[in-house]
């Protein structure tokens, strides 16, 4: 359970100080220096790719 007053972001998202809202951590693959990426705990999984044609 979250402490009172904490950022209300769900798993896989992180609070953006600049936008004042939660943002999807998946976008940090493309823009890793966005402010909210600091709060993204684990690297999002790479997109699944077939290993054969």
């Amino acid at each position: 359970e979250q402490a009172p007053g904490t950022a209300p972001c769900s798993r896989g998202s992180s609070w953006s100080a600049d936008l004042d809202k939660c943002m999807d951590c998946a976008s940090c693959r493309a823009r890793p220096h966005s402010d909210f990426c600091l709060g993204c705990a684990a690297a999002p999984p790479a997109p699944f790719r077939l290993l054969w044609p």
């Epitope: 992180s14 100080a17 600049d18 705990a41 684990a42």
Partner: antibody, heavy 120, light 103 residues
Framework: QVQLVQSGGGLVKPGGSLRLSCAAS????????MSWVRQAPGKGLEWVSA????????YYADSVKGRFTISRDNPKNTLYLQMNSLRAEDTAVYYC?????????????WGQGTLVTVSS | LTQSPGTLSLSPGERATLSCRAS?????LTWYQQKPGQAPRLLIY???SRATGIPNRFSGSGSGTDFTLTITRLEPEDFAVYYC?????????FGGGTKVEIT
């Protein structure tokens, strides 16, 4: 208990290099961003750098960009600050700190600090 | 971030009002306390939420560019330096600090 233990400070000549370490214990290291903050003698706090839990996102103050590198070894629960091209104005006590994203990026656990002196 | 006053001289039991002003609008602000020879201690996060273990005589308020830390009745252990901090444009920034000293 939750703690951060720092090492690696000391005396270095201008232009030299130094690596600071911060060993974390008592919490899931990968779940937290980490940061370095410094304090010159008799002065206020100055943020230096921060890194996300995965290590994939790094951030630097303009005053150290291109000279300092923040990194982390998650299996070893350790945060690092590699400092190159050191200047006299980098002389300070350096603190590592745990960043709480859900606390709107407040830093809730701090290391004991380590003194870096840059002097010839 | 500009903190004022630089030094506040008060007596135990008095009320302390510390100001932090940002040059651009800030969504949330953090406050720390630091005593000589010690690491900073998180007091207030998200402008007004007290960190774990912080007594309720400490409170934070404000919005936009003007923020305040209030200590309702100063205890002897509250005499220290207080810093505000923001996170904006992917940069963490501290104010210059306010020293609360015994008059």
């Amino acid at each position: 208990q939750v703690q951060l233990v720092q090492s690696g400070g000391g005396l270095v000549k201008p232009g030299g290099s130094l690596r600071l370490s911060c060993a974390a214990s008592g919490f899931t290291f990968t779940s937290y961003a980490m940061s370095w903050v410094r304090q010159a003698p008799g002065k206020g706090l100055e943020w230096v750098s921060a890194i996300s839990g995965s290590g994939g996102s790094t951030y630097y103050a303009d005053s150290v960009k291109g000279r300092f590198t923040i990194s982390r070894d998650n299996p070893k629960n350790t945060l690092y600050l590699q400092m190159n091209s050191l200047r006299a104005e980098d002389t300070a006590v350096y603190y590592c700190a745990r960043v709480r994203a859900n606390y709107y990026y407040g830093m809730d656990v701090w290391g004991q600090g380590t003194l870096v002196t840059v002097s010839s | 971030l500009t903190q004022s006053p630089g030094t506040l001289s008060l007596s135990p039991g008095e009320r302390a009002t510390l100001s932090c002003r940002a040059s651009q609008s800030v969504s949330r602000l953090t406050w720390y306390q630091q005593k000589p020879g010690q690491a900073p201690r998180l007091l207030i996060y998200g402008t007004s939420s007290r960190a774990t273990g912080i007594p309720n005589r400490f409170s934070g308020s404000g919005s936009g560019t003007d923020f305040t830390l209030t200590i309702t009745r100063l205890e002897p252990e509250d005499f220290a330096v207080y810093y505000c901090q923001q996170f904006r444009n992917s940069l963490l920034t501290f104010g210059g600090g306010t020293k609360v000293e015994i008059t």
